[in-house]
């Protein structure tokens, strides 16, 4: 007898889920520097906010030279997961103020998640680690007021916004090392 | 067309040693993390090892741990799976598994009997 | 005794539709982890069926689809046919093994 019959190929292999999760990535970049802008329409913004709940920002234009696959899909995935977090936070407790803007964030967070599914079956199909978020999750409670909320989503949308930007260029770098 | 086919199974006294051979073709080898998957007779599916798409990262079931060796060589398309001290437990089916897995081989029967 | 539990067996009549769970727990499906689902039919190797809870591999036809919630996902079969009688396997990665659980299996059965 001859070999045995080979498998079909399935819809996309590590490159074009990389090429892929570029994609998404600026897709999703554009969709929060446009949700920002938004934001600082209605509500105009008085300096900087942050949230301690958030994650720091993973890396500078500096250290971007000297990325590893494993390090900055694995940080990616996790910084993601916490902000995927914080927009159904703010969704389910931004109150009235928000409610306005409900249809771009359920946007924005089925993006997230399309992504998060996606860096994640790229890390499968390399058998790169995958572990789970190693920093304890912290219990989002309500918004102190209702300014109290759309402080926290000036401070969401912006990390977001650096995370996704310094993404882009992270999986751009590594797209040439596979 | 992808192709994994598996080599190297046969019968073995406890104690014993095989090495299984997976050679690839018709995708790209070297992009992809493979898997070596078992299966007992009658049984359900168990993950064995898998080792990353450049070989960087290795990981065992606890069954396995420190018995079994998996190693890749991407210039001959190649996957390996080193065996030692082999038990009856270890009877089954190889298969070896690319990606996710998303492909499979036709798989290798190891006998471990005396 | 698997990570993921499967009911052992399921069964339907033909173009009926069957459902087969997959429960994980926190630590994978609960932790973010997807899920994909494979068939085996008799005497061959598995085949990938689902992945990422819900995707279909070109060649699989649109009778099979795949959920996921919480901590458990689910592969629905509609318009059962007598060559879907196989085994169906759910995975999923787990951390604690850097390598994917498998379901102990579902031995489907076409009445």
């Known amino acids: 007898p001859g070999p045995p019959a080979g498998s079909p190929r399935v819809s996309s292999d590590p490159r074009a889920d990389l090429d892929s999760a570029v994609l998404l990535t600026r897709s999703l970049l554009a969709d929060t520097r446009q949700l920002a802008a938004q934001m600082r329409d209605k509500f105009p913004a008085d300096g900087d906010h942050s949230l301690d709940s958030l994650p720091t920002l993973a890396m500078s234009a500096g250290t971007l030279g000297s990325l590893q696959l494993p390090g900055v899909l694995t940080r990616l995935r996790v910084d993601l997961m916490s902000y995927l977090r914080h927009v159904q936070w703010l969704r389910r407790a931004g109150g009235p103020s928000l409610k306005t803007l409900e249809p771009e964030l359920g946007a924005l967070q089925a993006r997230l998640e399309r992504l998060l599914r996606r860096l994640q079956l790229l890390m499968s199909r390399l058998a790169l680690p995958q572990a789970a978020p190693d920093q304890p999750v912290i219990p989002l409670g309500p918004p102190a007021s209702a300014w109290g909320s759309i402080r926290a989503a000036h401070a969401i949308l912006g990390g977001l916004h650096l995370t996704l930007d310094w993404a882009v260029r992270g999986l751009l770098l590594l797209k040439t090392r596979l | 067309e992808v192709q994994l086919l598996e080599s190297g199974g046969g019968l073995v006294q406890p104690g014993g040693s095989l090495r299984l051979s997976c050679a690839a073709s018709g995708f790209t080898f070297s992009s992809y993390g493979m898997h070596w998957v078992r299966q007992a007779p009658g049984k359900g599916l168990e993950w064995v090892a898998v080792i990353s798409y450049d070989g960087s990262y290795k990981y065992y079931a606890d069954s396995v741990k420190g018995r079994f060796t998996i190693s890749r060589d991407n210039s001959k398309n190649t996957l390996y799976l080193q065996m030692n001290s082999l038990r009856a437990e270890d009877t089954a089916v190889y298969y070896c598994a690319a990606g996710v897995p998303d492909y499979w081989g036709q798989g290798t029967l190891v006998t471990v009997s005396s | 005794q698997s990570v993921l539990t499967q009911p052992p067996s399921a069964s339907g009549t033909p173009g009926q539709r069957v459902t087969i769970s997959c429960s994980g727990s926190?630590?994978?499906?609960?932790?973010?982890?997807?899920v994909h689902w494979y068939q085996q039919l008799p005497g061959t190797a598995p085949k990938l069926l689902i992945y990422?809870?819900?995707e279909r591999p070109s060649g699989v036809p649109d009778r099979f689809s795949g959920s996921k919630s919480g901590t458990s996902a689910s592969l629905a079969i509609s318009g059962l046919r007598s060559e879907d009688e196989a085994d169906y396997y759910c995975?999923?990665?787990?951390?604690?093994?850097?390598?994917?659980?498998f379901g102990g299996g579902t031995k489907l059965t076409v009445l």
């Open positions: 995975a999923a990665w787990d951390p604690s093994l850097s390598g994917p659980v």
């Open positions: 990422s809870n819900e």
């Open positions: 926190s630590s994978n499906i609960g932790s973010g982890y997807d």
